[in-house]
């Protein structure tokens, strides 16, 4: 149950946020239990945990992953959890903090000395709300790559957006993930509807760049729902 989740040590002892949100240098953070979060222009102290529901890692922050907070807990209750630091246990790459990846069940550094050659990434994608994969199986993909300190350029294999250079994001391409350009004004974007989850996206687009949002193109308002074109537009 959620109460047991919120009262469990797994939740209470989560490390506090590592710092303010990207692009928001004014965001202050204190040690738990009093954590400051942005609230418009004001900062309010929240003395208890804020469960943030999710269906996939992309709904969480870069320093988080999406999972059930209790071991063997209700699979339907997934929330954003703090990423795991080096030498902590893991089951997949997204559980490890940026700069690390999951190898043999342990988060290890993905820097030049630790991470060369082949990596294996298990990508279990959920299509629609039933959390089944395209063919009902978890797809295991071997990605041949060389990971260095330099950020990935366009087309480079990645695990998360922080692996990619500025102006790029880590997006799905077939059954792997590569660095793709963040969308510019006027470019076609994918509108994720609240009902229906993220659908079948084997060629995932990046999100719209700073100051842009994915909105229906004005001259397409008359079109049917299914054919409506969304583009990145100024707020």
């Amino acid at each position: 149950t959620l109460n047991s989740v919120l009262n469990s040590n797994a939740i209470k002892n989560l490390p506090p946020p590592l710092g303010g949100a990207a692009g928001h240098p004014g965001s202050a953070v204190s040690a738990a239990p009093g954590i400051l979060y942005p609230g418009g222009n004001k900062y309010q102290t929240i003395d208890n945990y804020q469960p943030y529901p999710c269906a996939e890692d992309e709904e969480c922050g870069t320093d988080e992953y999406c999972a059930s907070p209790t071991r063997g807990g209700d699979a339907g209750v997934q929330i954003c959890l703090a990423c795991r630091k080096r030498r902590k246990r893991c089951m997949r790459h997204a559980m490890c903090c940026p700069g690390n990846y999951c190898k043999n069940g342990i988060c290890v550094s993905s820097d030049q000395n630790h991470f060369r050659g082949e990596i294996e990434e298990t990508i279990t994608e959920s299509f629609g709300n039933d959390h089944s994969t395209l063919d009902g199986y978890s797809r295991r993909t071997t990605l041949s790559s060389k990971m260095y300190h330099t950020k990935g350029q366009e087309g480079s294999v990645c695990l998360r957006s922080s692996d990619c250079a500025s102006g790029l994001c880590c997006a799905r391409h077939f059954w792997s993930k590569i660095c793709k350009p963040v969308l510019k004004e006027g470019q076609v974007c994918t509108k994720h509807r609240r009902k229906g989850s993220h659908g079948l996206e084997i060629f995932q687009r990046c999100y719209c760049g700073e100051g842009l949002s994915c909105r229906i193109q004005k001259d397409h308002h008359q079109a049917s729902n299914s054919s409506r074109l969304h583009t990145c537009q100024r707020h």
């Epitope: 804020q50 890692d57 992309e58 709904e59 922050g61 988080e64 709300n129 994720h192 993220h198 909105r215």
Partner: nanobody, 123 residues
Amino acid sequence: EVQLVESGGGLVQPGGSLRLSCAASGIPFSTRTMGWFRQAPGKEREFVAAISSGATTLYADSVKGRFTISADNSKNTAYLQMNSLKPEDTAVYYCAAGNGGRAYGYSRARYEWGQGTLVTVSS
């Protein structure tokens, strides 16, 4: 800037129902997680319910089966349907909008708050 305006609060008898609304502006609504929190007098603010952009819902045990969270993308509005209200549900109810997580460059997925609406359950 995110703006959240709650409405629908008021005085209701035990066993009654209320529907809270939260009109959001300044955010691409359909891609954001929306939530409701509450704060009773002299107590800490507590989580009530949330709905993610992928329609994943989450409820506090104390309201499960009585409260229902929903969102209407076309109206940029989140709702909290509260049935079988109890005196212990009396609190200021705050609408919360998720910051959008990594898609918006945030290291942590967290909420931004509205000003709140008072719900009083009393006979």
